[in-house]
């Protein structure tokens, strides 16, 4: 599942190349292992902003698929309460390119621990 | 064809650079507030084909209290007082419903 999430992220990266989306998105660039589910929640929430602002059906579908995949992968530990983690709104806002790069890194973190 | 002034969003302001069709503008959350993750500050001037009237799209933006400020512990009461001055809580700017800045 996580491997498919990476391929969806690559697809989103390719699709937004031709678009001008100037949004800045809350980005956790240094994820602590004890806060990875909380960080993933922020990435998934902010991914929806890309979908909303692109107005593109392919991006919309890919974002929804990615969220479905991540949700199912996290259904076992999605309700784990991580304490002492930053809320999404406390994170630094970064451009879409940096956001997607950091997103790939956190997914790889999940791949390495699954 | 141009758009009218955009709608108000609670705890946010907007400085419109262009009212022309297809113009994309962003709301900014007021000081002490942050854009809620997953919501978009973007609004676009679009044409309603049925009525031929331009309007701004409704942003999904929600501005919430900055969690960094919410989490801050109040400083312990000071033993030194300044005569004649009563410390006031920092007042937040209006919600955005009361005022808008529309720059042409």
């Amino acid at each position: 599942n996580w491997v498919n999430v990476i391929s969806d992220l690559k697809k989103i990266e390719d699709l937004i190349q031709s678009m001008h989306i100037d949004a800045t998105l809350y980005t956790e660039s240094d994820v602590h292992p004890s806060c990875k589910v909380t960080a993933m929640k922020c990435f998934l929430l902010e991914l929806q902003v890309i979908s909303l602002e692109s107005g593109d059906a392919s991006i919309h579908d890919t974002v929804e698929n990615l969220i479905i995949l991540a949700n199912n992968s996290l259904s076992s530990n999605g309700n784990v309460t991580e304490s002492g983690c930053k809320e999404c709104e406390e994170l630094e806002e970064k451009n879409i390119k940096e956001f997607l790069q950091s997103f790939v890194h956190i997914v790889q973190m999940f791949i390495n621990t699954s | 064809i141009t758009c009218p002034p955009p709608m108000s969003v609670e705890h946010a302001d907007i400085w419109v650079k262009s009212y022309s069709l297809y113009s994309r503008e962003r709301y900014i959350c007021n000081s002490g507030f942050k854009r809620k993750a997953g919501t978009s500050s973007l609004t676009e001037c679009v044409l309603n084909k049925a009525t031929n009237v331009a309007h701004w799209t409704t942003p999904s933006l929600k501005c919430i209290r900055d969690p960094a400020l919410v989490h801050q512990r109040p400083a312990p009461p000071s033993t030194v007082t300044t005569a004649g001055v009563t410390p006031q809580p920092e007042s937040l700017s209006p919600s955005g419903k009361e005022h808008h800045h529309h720059h042409h």
């Epitope: 589910v37 993933m40 929640k41 998934l44 929430l45 929806q48 979908s51 909303l52 059906a57 392919s58 919309h60 579908d61 890919t62 974002v63 929804e64 698929n65 969220i67 479905i68 991540a70 949700n71 199912n72 996290l74 259904s75 999605g78 309700n79 | 997953g38």
Partner: antibody, heavy 122, light 112 residues
Framework: EVQLVESGGGLVQPGGSLRLSCAAS????????MSWVRQAPGKGLEWVAT????????YYPDSVKGRFTISRDNSKNTLYLQMNSLRAEDTAVYYC???????????????WGQGTLVTVSS | DVVMTQSPLSLPVTLGQPASISCRSS???????????LEWYQQRPGQSPRLLIY???NRFSGVPDRFSGSGSGTDFTLKISRVEAEDVGVYYC?????????FGQGTKLEIK
């Protein structure tokens, strides 16, 4: 008024195939994900398949995975369900339903067709 | 898979009286983004299902306000404040937070 009309149901032998169609009208078909839901005679509802707006992504429960294929033709405003290797337990009324997007309003099947009956029997 | 369990399976109600249907999921259906995709569908005799409530408590357009949804986590409830004759039918809860999406077994509401 949103309209969804299923067709293609009928009697088929076990191991056989059938293709259901769902004609959509009065809404922009390509803007919505679509689903198939079935109901065995006198029983409850069972989700069968979902397809994304553009048709690139499909989702199935294990009970039909590998046997059923959901697809769509946005130029014809039509949803399909190709059913292969049919079994007696696939006997049901098959409904197509329009699915509201997660990103714009939370998942939900807001409009349903009248259903088409599929009977698998020798 | 998430198993949805409804109770009661049969609910005889007097016209004008309230009715309450419970739906319990085998695990929390709060998704990673904090949303709970829980719907309620009504199926009148001989008809197709119809959406009543989405995301736990949001009434779909055209649904009378005597219908209300509540709950969180694993426990959800559909309430009808005053049952009318047209409310007769089977009510299903449905989760689409996690694939495979699953329905409850249904609760048959009938008039006493």
């Amino acid at each position: 008024e949103v309209q969804l009309v299923e067709s293609g149901g009928g009697l088929v032998q076990p191991g056989g195939s059938l293709r259901l169609s769902c004609a959509a009208s009065e809404f922009t078909f390509s803007n919505y994900a679509m689903s198939w839901v079935r109901q065995a005679p006198g029983k409850g509802l069972e989700w069968v398949a979902t397809i994304s707006r553009g048709g690139d992504y499909t989702y199935y429960p294990d009970s039909v995975k590998g046997r059923f294929t959901i697809s769509r033709d946005n130029s014809k405003n039509t949803l399909y369900l190709q059913m292969n290797s049919l079994r007696a337990e696939d006997t049901a009324v098959y409904y197509c339903a329009r699915r509201v997007s997660m990103i714009t309003g939370g998942w939900a099947m807001d409009y349903w067709g009248q259903g088409t009956l599929v009977t698998v029997s020798s | 898979d998430v198993v949805m369990t409804q109770s009661p399976l049969s609910l005889p109600v007097t016209l004008g009286q309230p009715a309450s249907i419970s739906c319990r999921s085998s695990q929390s259906i709060v998704d990673i983004t904090g949303n709970t995709y829980l719907e309620w569908y009504q199926q009148r005799p001989g008809q197709s299902p119809r959406l009543l409530i989405y995301k736990v408590f949001n009434r779909f357009s055209g649904v009378p306000d005597r219908f209300s949804g509540s709950g969180s986590g694993t426990d959800f409830t559909l309430k009808i404040s005053r049952v009318e004759a047209e409310d007769v039918g089977v009510y299903y809860c449905f989760q689409d937070s996690f694939v495979p999406y699953t329905f409850g077994q249904g609760t048959k509401l009938e008039i006493k």
